[in-house]
Interface confidence: medium
């Protein structure tokens, strides 16, 4: 694992530009959005300091048929060097807690921006 400020990411560090594109996409799907994303689907909450892109993808893999996050899923898979199957990183779930997709995306977005600001991906 390549550990970046506690954000473990299997494989090489994603390039800065790709990370910014991911951040921009997460912003796109959350800006001024009040309707529940993906019909209010719930996903496993993950420990963002211990988890990484593959863990985030693992959690979102459980959501299907939601066009709003399909691009995010594709982008996350580009950061993850191996194929992720649902439940693969269950040990990094937060006390078996589930949260709405919208909150998951918001938490992920804030964490990625924090890492970017701190220069973790530059």
């Amino acid at each position: 694992l390549t550990c970046l400020g506690g954000f473990a990411s299997p494989g090489p560090v994603p390039p800065s530009t790709a990370l910014r594109e991911l951040i921009e996409e997460l912003v796109n799907i959350t800006q001024n959005q009040k309707a529940p994303l993906c019909n209010g689907s719930m996903v496993w909450s993950i420990n963002l300091t211990a988890g990484g892109f593959c863990v985030a993808l693992d959690s979102l893999t459980n959501v299907s048929g939601c066009s709003a996050i399909e691009k995010t899923q594709r982008m996350l898979s580009g950061f993850c060097p191996h194929k992720v199957s649902a439940g693969q990183f269950s040990s990094l779930h937060v006390r078996d807690t589930k949260i709405e997709v919208a909150q998951f995306v918001k938490d992920l977005l804030l964490h990625l921006k924090k890492l970017f600001r701190e220069g973790q991906f530059n």
Epitope: I23, K106, L110
Partner: antibody
Framework: EVQLVESGGGLVKPGGSLRLSCAAS????????MSWVRQAPGKGLEWVGR??????????NYAAPVKGRFTISRDDSKNTLYLQMNSLKTEDTAVYYC?????????????????WGQGTLVTVSS | SYELTQPPSVSVSPGQTARITCSGD??????AYWYQQKSGQAPVLVIY???KRPSGIPERFSGSSSGTMATLTISGAQVEDEADYYC???????????FGGGTKLTVL
């Protein structure tokens, strides 16, 4: 104290150009999304456009009536927002306001355009 | 292009409840924001994300939203609340902002 101060307004002939500036202070400008809003004399508010923070992609969106004529830009090192207005028309006559669109967006909050400047008057007339 | 529709004017007596509505097709999925503008002054945000009140805004201001309609309510309107009120939101993409035409609130 969060503050926005616009400048650069004035009288210009139809077809002319003008550049407005908005100096920001009291908050982390580079984190904020910034908007321009205008108000023609005796009329309502009209959204002109918005620029995201660079970390959020720096995307710029414009209202249909100004697209292709107006350009929004920012200089984070100078804490300044700009509005370059070209091919001005008489209907562009208005008070132009800059506003912070998302001071808290970096931290996951969205307060709307919660801080506004005092506005600068642009008059387009022959 | 996307539009938000407001009544041009609303009149109430001091102490009465004033309600200003704003309708738009994207409001079921996009938040509404409300601005107060007094003559010759810059707008002031009074409600954000449908229902939230910024610090410093009196409790008599509240917001609600249902379907394609957002509503600004001023409970016990006071003379100093006389102003133009504008709703603001975005189109369904979230990329383009739009203001309603504005409502002139008269407190007689």
């Amino acid at each position: 104290e969060v503050q926005l101060v616009e400048s650069g307004g004035g009288l210009v002939k139809p077809g002319g150009s003008l550049r407005l500036s908005c100096a920001a202070s009291g908050f982390t400008f580079s984190n904020a999304w910034m908007s321009w809003v205008r108000q023609a004399p005796g009329k309502g508010l009209e959204w002109v456009g918005r620029i995201r923070s660079k970390i959020d992609g720096g995307t710029i969106n414009y209202a249909a009536p100004v697209k292709g004529r107006f350009t929004i830009s920012r200089d984070d090192s100078k804490n300044t927002l700009y509005l370059q207005m070209n091919s001005l028309k008489t209907e562009d006559t208005a008070v132009y306001y800059c506003a912070t669109d998302q001071v808290g967006a970096y931290y996951g909050d969205y307060y709307g355009m919660d801080v506004w400047g005092q506005g600068t008057l642009v008059t387009v007339s022959s | 292009s996307y539009e938000l529709t407001q009544p041009p004017s609303v009149s109430v007596s001091p102490g009465q409840t004033a309600r200003i509505t704003c309708s738009g097709d994207a409001l079921p999925e996009k938040y509404a924001y409300w601005y107060q503008q007094k003559s010759g002054q810059a707008p002031v945000l009074v409600i954000y994300e449908d229902t939230k009140r910024p610090s410093g805004i009196p409790e008599r201001f509240s917001g609600s939203s249902s379907g394609t309609m957002a509503t600004l309510t001023i409970s016990g309107a006071q003379v100093e609340d006389e102003a133009d009120y504008y709703c603001y939101s975005t189109d369904s993409s979230g990329n383009h902002g739009v203001f309603g035409g504005g409502t002139k609130l008269t407190v007689l």
